[in-house]
């Protein structure tokens, strides 16, 4: 059986950012017709991963994997019917918990973001890394950068590659 | 709502292996009472990630995230009732597709492993990386090493930390 992953282009972009590979990021962003300001915004986030070194990429990869494979990303089956599940959680749409995490990473406070990551039983070192990254992003990105990052995320979520 | 991720200790070990950090791997393995031969087996796998450099870790992290967030890891809701889903896919058990991938990584041929990864619409560069890692593991690990890795996986899957 062929299986469709949830929003592959999102994970392509995430891993390109976390990897620190500018070429890989450019390739992924071209697929969703990113504007220059949107690219600039993503590269500022990428800079934070690069500055924090390899351990940062691995730990944040762990956060992403954990959230992506969490209970709530598997559908709130208790409150939904099978039909709802078919419609809502088995499509190629990105999981709401992942969306929320990314949203908080851009628009929330470091405390809010770390608190959300902490819900996933993350190790202290993972939480500390999340805080460092979040503070770095807040320092690097202007309000305009964050708006551009959010508009790019909209493009990603609504892309045929998602 | 507090959310329980699926088998956190498994992802701890996976990322420690892929990260190439021996200390982090030792810490994770201590939690599941790994024997010396089991540790040796995992370190041989880790060597393959280290030898293949950063890109290998990032690409394989992408494979793991993709499989973990795939349709089949979200439960075959179409064929199950909500009650079944509550019991079978919303627990802390590792997803069968992840289990199968890890099993093929250890006991299958490179062709089989790459074919399974390919089901998740992986990019050619991801597939080639998967093949390189798998061939490396086959070259490094003896029959005994693989048996020890499999016994460690059993410990992980049945651990209270899973």
């Amino acid at each position: 059986v062929k299986m469709a992953e949830t929003c592959p282009i999102f994970y392509d972009v995430f891993f390109a950012v976390a990897n620190g590979n500018e070429l890989l990021l450019d390739l992924s962003l071209t697929k969703v017709n990113a504007t220059e300001p949107e690219r600039t915004a993503m590269k500022k986030i990428q800079d934070c991963y690069v500055e924090n070194g390899l351990i940062s990429r691995v730990l944040d990869g762990l956060v992403m994997t954990t959230i992506s494979s969490s209970k709530d990303c598997m559908g709130e089956a208790v409150q939904n019917t099978v039909e709802d599940l078919k419609l809502n959680t088995l499509g190629r749409e990105i999981c709401p918990a992942v969306k929320r995490g990314v949203d908080l990473f851009l628009t929330g406070t470091p405390d809010e973001y770390v608190e959300q990551v902490a819900q996933y039983k993350a190790l202290p070192v993972v939480l500390e890394n999340a805080r460092i990254l979040k503070n770095c992003v807040d320092a690097k990105m202007t309000e305009e950068d964050k708006e551009n990052a959010l508009s790019l995320l909209d493009k990603i979520y609504t892309s045929p590659l998602c | 709502v507090k959310m329980a991720e699926t088998c956190p200790i498994f992802y701890d070990v996976f990322f420690a292996v892929a990260n190439g950090n021996e200390l982090l791997l030792d810490l994770s393995l201590t939690k599941v009472n790994a024997t010396e031969p089991e540790r040796t087996a995992m370190k041989k796998i880790q060597d393959c990630y280290v030898e293949n450099g950063l890109i290998s870790r990032v690409l394989d992290g992408l494979v793991m995230t993709t499989i973990s967030s795939s349709k089949d890891c979200m439960g075959e809701a179409v064929q199950n009732t909500v009650e079944d889903l509550k019991l079978n896919t919303l627990g802390r058990e590792i997803c069968p597709a992840v289990k199968r991938g890890v099993d093929l990584f250890l006991t299958g041929t490179p062709d089989e492993y790459v074919e399974q990864v390919a089901q998740y619409k992986a990019l050619p560069v991801v597939l080639e990386n998967a093949r390189i890692l798998k061939n490396c593991v086959d070259a490094k690990m003896t029959e005994e090493d693989k048996e020890n890795a499999l016994s460690l996986l059993d410990k992980i899957y049945t651990s209270p930390l899973c």
């Epitope: - | 250890l106 062709d111 061939n135």
Partner: antibody, heavy 120, light 106 residues
Framework: EVQLVESGGGLVKPGGSLRLSCAAS????????MNWIRQAPGKGLEWISY????????YYADSVKGRFTISRDNAKNSLYLQMNSLRAEDTAVYYC?????????????WGQGTLVTVSS | EIVMTQSPDFQSVAPKEKVTITCRAS??????LHWYQQKPDQSPKLLIK???QSFSGVPSRFSGSGSGTDFTLTINSLEAEDAATYYC????????FGQGTKVEIK
Amino acid sequence: EVQLVESGGGLVKPGGSLRLSCAASGFTFSDYYMNWIRQAPGKGLEWISYISSSDDTTYYADSVKGRFTISRDNAKNSLYLQMNSLRAEDTAVYYCARDGKYNTVAGDHWGQGTLVTVSS
Amino acid sequence: EIVMTQSPDFQSVAPKEKVTITCRASQNIGSSLHWYQQKPDQSPKLLIKYASQSFSGVPSRFSGSGSGTDFTLTINSLEAEDAATYYCLQSYTLRTFGQGTKVEIK
């Protein structure tokens, strides 16, 4: 002691069919991947197919794809090769070979081979 | 398809001399290269697995080296019983044999 004994070879006309068997003993057959390899008279070795231990995966060389089918019966400790639409160029000694457990090596033990001759 | 090219095709060597057989892959195959010996009217026997690992029971005069695309089988001090054809096999993607190298005792 590991033993692999091929049988079923013989003379067959072009376009005909033949089924080769390989009887395994001296090891837990169901734990091992198995291969068929052939050697045309006076020529080199050519890998043609392998099958996983649990019989759920098979792979073939392009030269035999669509004509040959590898299968196994773990209960009978037997490996098979069904050969259809045979051609003169399929004339060869056919060997079955075992892979190391958990794919730790390709072809660690071989049978003595069975000769297949395709001729009118 | 990965193509394996062995050289030379034929080698005539005096006893006690060193024999070197090379195998070249058409693409990088890591260490997924194995060496076999086939004596006349016998089935092949595994000598070296994964480029450099000796298979059990194989005399120590046989050794393998290389990785990526270039591999070597060395017989350090040739003995009369080593007269045979030697084949390399890649298992990186499916399986492919080299065309073989026949070693004759001078």
